[in-house]
C-alpha cells in the first residue's frame, strides 16, 4: 500500500508568530531512518520551508538556520514553525519519506491551512 | 532556471562499460533526489536508478541491479550513471529527472543515446 | 512491484475533439499518480501530480482525476500541439513505474 499522511486542516499561529501541528503517518513497514520535510504552497508554487532526518526513537535535527523544531513519537512527528507573519499564511504540506531499510516509500498530506495575523502596535503611552 | 543536461552516450560493445554525467544547475542540487530514467528505441519509460539526499541513500530497477551504480557529487551538482556489463537491451536513451519536492519527476534532461552493439 | 496498465494504446481523434485516457494501477497508490506528455525527439513534459493538481505552465484543458487504483487524463479539447504520447506514473513508492503508454493521434 502506498503511505497515508495526516495533519490538521486548519492551524492558528499564536501572538509570537509561531504555529505548531502534528504530522502523522501510517508506515508500511519497519523504517528506522525517516525524512520529514515541511513544504509550502502558495498558488501553484511549493517551496521547502525546512526538512530533516532521523532515525527512529531519536530527535528530530533541523539546521541551525531553521524556523522550524520537532519532536518524534513512534509515527507521530510534532512540528512548531516559528517567525511567522501574516505574509507567511498559507498551505503546509508535511511530506514523509521511509529512507531506510528498502523499500522507500513517500507520503504526502494535504497540507495545514496556517493562519497568521501579525500583533496590533502597542499604543503610544504618555 | 533549472536545467539537466546529461552527456557521455555513445557507441560501446556488449560487455564493456559507459558512464553518463547530468550537470544540473538552477537549484538547490543536493535538497533533491535524482533519477535515472531509460526509454529504448520506440518504447516507453523504464525508471533505473534513484539516489537519495545522502549519497548512500540509493535504489536500482531490478534490471539495473549489480551492473550499474547511480552516484553524485553534490560540490559539482553533477549525477552519474556508471553502466557495467552492457548489454544489446540497454540500448535506450537516457534522461536525468529532479524528483520534485511533492515527489514526480518536474525536470528532465533532453536525454543521451546510449547503443550497446557489436 | 506496482503495475500500471494504459488503455487504449491508441487514440485517434479530431481536433477539437474531448480525449479520455485511462490508467489503473495494480494495488492502492492512493494520490501518487502523475502524467507526462512526450512528443517524438523530446524528453516528457510532467502535466499532472497528485492525481490532478497541474503542473506549472500545464493548460486548463488537461485535467486528472480518481483515486485508489483507477486514474484518467482527460483533454477537454485537442489542439494540434497534444497529438503525442502520455505516460501515467506512480511515484508512492519503489520501484517508481510508467505505465506502457497512450498514444493520441490525428483521425
Known amino acids: 500500500k502506498a503511505m497515508h499522511v495526516a495533519q490538521p486542516a486548519v492551524v492558528l499561529a499564536n501572538s509570537r508568530g509561531t504555529a505548531s501541528f502534528v504530522c502523522e503517518y501510517a508506515s508500511p513497514g519497519k523504517a528506522t531512518e525517516v525524512r520529514v520535510t515541511v513544504l509550502r504552497q502558495a498558488d501553484s508554487q511549493v517551496t521547502e520551508v525546512c526538512a530533516a532526518t532521523y532515525m527512529m526513537g531519536n530527535e528530530l535535527t533541523f539546521l541551525d538556520d531553521s524556523i522550524c523544531t520537532g519532536t518524534s513519537s513512534g509515527n507521530q512527528v510534532n512540528l512548531t514553525i516559528q517567525g511567522l507573519r501574516a505574509m507567511d499564511t498559507g498551505l503546509y504540506i508535511c511530506k514523509v519519506e521511509l529512507m531506510y531499510p528498502p523499500p522507500y516509500y513517500m507520503g504526502i498530506g494535504n497540507g495545514t491551512q496556517i493562519y497568521v495575523i501579525d500583533p496590533e502596535p502597542c499604543p503610544d503611552s504618555d | 532556471q533549472v536545467q539537466l543536461v546529461e552527456s557521455g552516450g555513445g557507441v560501446v560493445e556488449p560487455g564493456r562499460s559507459l558512464r553518463l554525467s547530468c550537470a544540473a544547475s538552477?537549484?538547490?542540487?543536493?535538497?533533491?533526489?535524482m533519477h535515472w530514467v531509460r526509454q529504448a528505441p520506440g518504447k516507453g519509460l523504464e525508471w533505473v536508478a534513484v539516489i537519495w539526499y545522502k549519497p548512500s541513500e540509493k535504489d536500482y530497477a531490478d534490471s539495473a541491479k549489480g551492473r550499474f551504480t547511480i552516484s553524485r557529487d553534490n560540490s559539482k551538482n553533477t549525477l552519474y550513471l556508471q553502466m557495467n556489463s552492457l548489454r544489446a537491451e540497454d540500448t535506450a536513451v537516457y534522461y536525468c529527472a529532479r524528483g520534485g519536492l511533492l515527489g514526480y519527476f518536474d525536470y528532465w534532461g533532453q536525454g543521451t543515446l546510449v547503443t550497446v552493439s557489436s | 512491484e506496482i503495475v500500471l496498465t494504459q488503455s487504449p494504446g491508441t487514440l485517434s481523434l479530431s481536433p477539437g475533439e474531448r480525449a479520455t485516457l485511462s490508467c489503473r494501477a495494480s494495488?492502492?497508490?492512493?494520490?501518487?499518480l502523475a502524467w507526462y506528455q512526450q512528443k517524438p525527439g523530446q524528453a516528457p513534459r510532467p502535466l499532472i501530480y497528485g492525481v490532478s493538481s497541474r503542473a506549472t505552465g500545464i493548460p486548463d484543458r488537461f485535467s486528472g482525476s480518481g483515486s485508489g487504483t483507477d486514474f484518467t487524463l482527460t483533454i477537454s479539447r485537442l489542439e494540434p500541439e497534444d497529438f503525442a504520447v502520455y505516460y501515467c506514473q506512480q511515484y508512492g513508492r519503489y520501484p517508481f513505474t510508467f505505465g506502457p503508454g497512450t498514444k493520441v493521434d490525428i483521425k
Open positions: 494495488q492502492s497508490i492512493n494520490s501518487y
Open positions: 538552477g537549484f538547490t542540487f543536493s535538497s533533491y533526489g
